[in-house]
């Protein structure tokens, strides 16, 4: 804490300008009026203050706004935002997307810090849901943002927001997250025609059930192997050889390279070798010809 000292004569700041970089910490404390600082926050960013000087400026704002800064100040914090703690940010009420963008810009190129995470959390909670514009903004700054949310948090994403999601935004999502996002995507894109629909839904298919994969197999979609490998194993297992062949089109060629990996490996074990032979790829490990296949899960359901 900087001790209270009187401002030397002639040093009282009339405005926030470059002359202040020559002020010592105690002079800044004594000579810069907090209300003036608040109204001229937009100038702070253009002045090369030291970290110590920024600490003093933050301290002045904290004294002026003990209950949390108003949005007019927050929007112009600039690099001073990096000095804020998650505790400081929890006091804020940020409602403007422009404010959010301004602060995210300060942290651009860096990992999501606890400060940014808190800011985003406050903003989204304030809005009540992740609308399209917010999602657009967040994924632009942090492509992995969507996949950092829990399935519960993702459930608040309205289907209309799914239009903002790019394939790379889903790269790190796990199956539980895709289970939540897929039905929303299906709803969002439901009015698109076959090929356009597939292009949009492709990234979300890790959450698709068997019946949807069967339906896609009837539409000449040519799913690539990278997408196929991300499908839920339990959704792939019931597919027939003919359905997988139709689903993949010319990409069926890639099954051979993936025959030791899930879900291909598990799927192969469920198919008759005769049926696998129809692909002509040399896939081995299917059920030998003449063997009877009992579906025990069906038997359990009946008893």
């Amino acid at each position: 804490e900087v001790e209270k000292t009187a401002c030397p004569s002639g040093k009282k700041a009339r405005e926030i300008d470059e002359s202040l970089i020559f002020y010592k910490k105690w002079e800044l404390e004594a000579c810069v009026d907090a209300a003036l600082l608040a109204t001229q926050m937009d100038r702070v960013n253009a002045i090369p203050f030291t970290y110590e000087q920024l600490d003093v400026l933050k301290h002045k704002l904290d004294e002026l706004y003990p209950q949390g800064y108003p949005e007019s100040v927050i929007q112009h914090l600039g690099y001073l935002f990096l000095k804020m703690s998650p505790e400081d940010i929890r006091k804020w009420n940020v409602t403007s997307l422009e404010t959010l963008k301004a602060l995210l810009e300060v942290n651009k190129g860096h990992e999501m810090s606890p400060q940014v995470a808190t800011l985003i959390d406050r903003f989204v909670k304030g809005r009540g849901q992740l609308d399209k514009d917010t999602l657009d903004t967040l994924t632009a700054f942090y492509p992995g943002y969507l996949c950092s949310l829990s399935p519960e948090e993702l459930s608040s994403v309205p289907p209309s927001s799914i239009w903002a999601v790019r394939p790379q935004d889903l790269d790190t999502c796990d199956p539980r997250q895709l289970d939540v996002l897929y039905p929303k995507a299906r709803l969002a894109f439901q009015n698109m025609n076959g090929s356009e629909y597939f292009v949009k839904i492709q990234s979300f298919l890790g959450g698709a059930p068997t019946e949807d994969l069967k339906a896609l197999s009837q539409q000449n979609v040519s799913m690539d192997l990278a997408t196929f490998m991300k499908l839920r194993t339990d959704a792939v297992l019931p597919l027939t050889v003919a359905e997988v062949q139709k689903l993949l089109g010319p990409h069926v060629e890639g099954l051979k390279a993936e025959e030791r990996h899930r879900p291909v490996r598990d799927w192969i074990l469920r198919q008759r070798q005769d049926d696998l032979d129809t692909l002509g790829l040399g896939l081995q490990g299917g059920i030998p010809n003449g063997y009877l296949v009992l579906d025990l899960s069906m038997q359990e359901a009946l008893s």
Epitope: G249, P250, E253, A257, L276, D277, T278, G280, L281, G282
Partner: antibody, heavy 114, light 107 residues
Amino acid sequence: QVQLQQPGTELVKPGASVRLSCRASGYSFSSYWMHWVKQRPGQGLEWLGNINPTTGDINYNEKFRNRATLAVDKSSTTAYLQLTSLTSEDSAVYFCVRHDGFLWGQGTTLTVSS
Amino acid sequence: DIQMTQSPASLSASVGETVTITCRASENIYSYLAWYQQKQGKSPQLLVYYAKTLAEGVSSRFSGSGSGTQFSLKINSLQPEDFGTYYCQHQFGTPRTFGGGTKLEIR
């Protein structure tokens, strides 16, 4: 061992037909498409077509569709390429190739000459 | 049909050198590309499949790379047995066209 056996040479007259054979052994013949590739002396490789021994499905290079016929005999694990209306342009080495590209026959040298 | 364009058509290099052969597809073939080596009077031999997977028994001096439409085969530290003709072939549907070949000769 795993191999594709082809006769070394075939000599036929222009206008005639020929049936080239390729006998597979040492692997599950039904599990792989069989491809045929043509190579004229001093030239590159040209894909003629392929056949699925299990389903009987066949794909042809359009250039050869009218004069080439692919067939298989699963009981003898042999694939066949029949060429009709032969000309000197058909003089080449014909290879049979297992679908994965790992296995090639030694090739049959077809000479079309009167 | 997918056209495969290989370059250069011929190449002379010395033992110990590193050479690169390229292959361009007329449309996206993802990673469905194979490279073969053929010696005079012999059947072609598979070197690389799925663009970068080395076939069993092939020297690690060979490496494949690329995806989509641009591919290359690199041979490090050339050995006398590496000289011959190299072909690329796409494996994405039919017809399975080959590149025109690259003849690698000893300088």
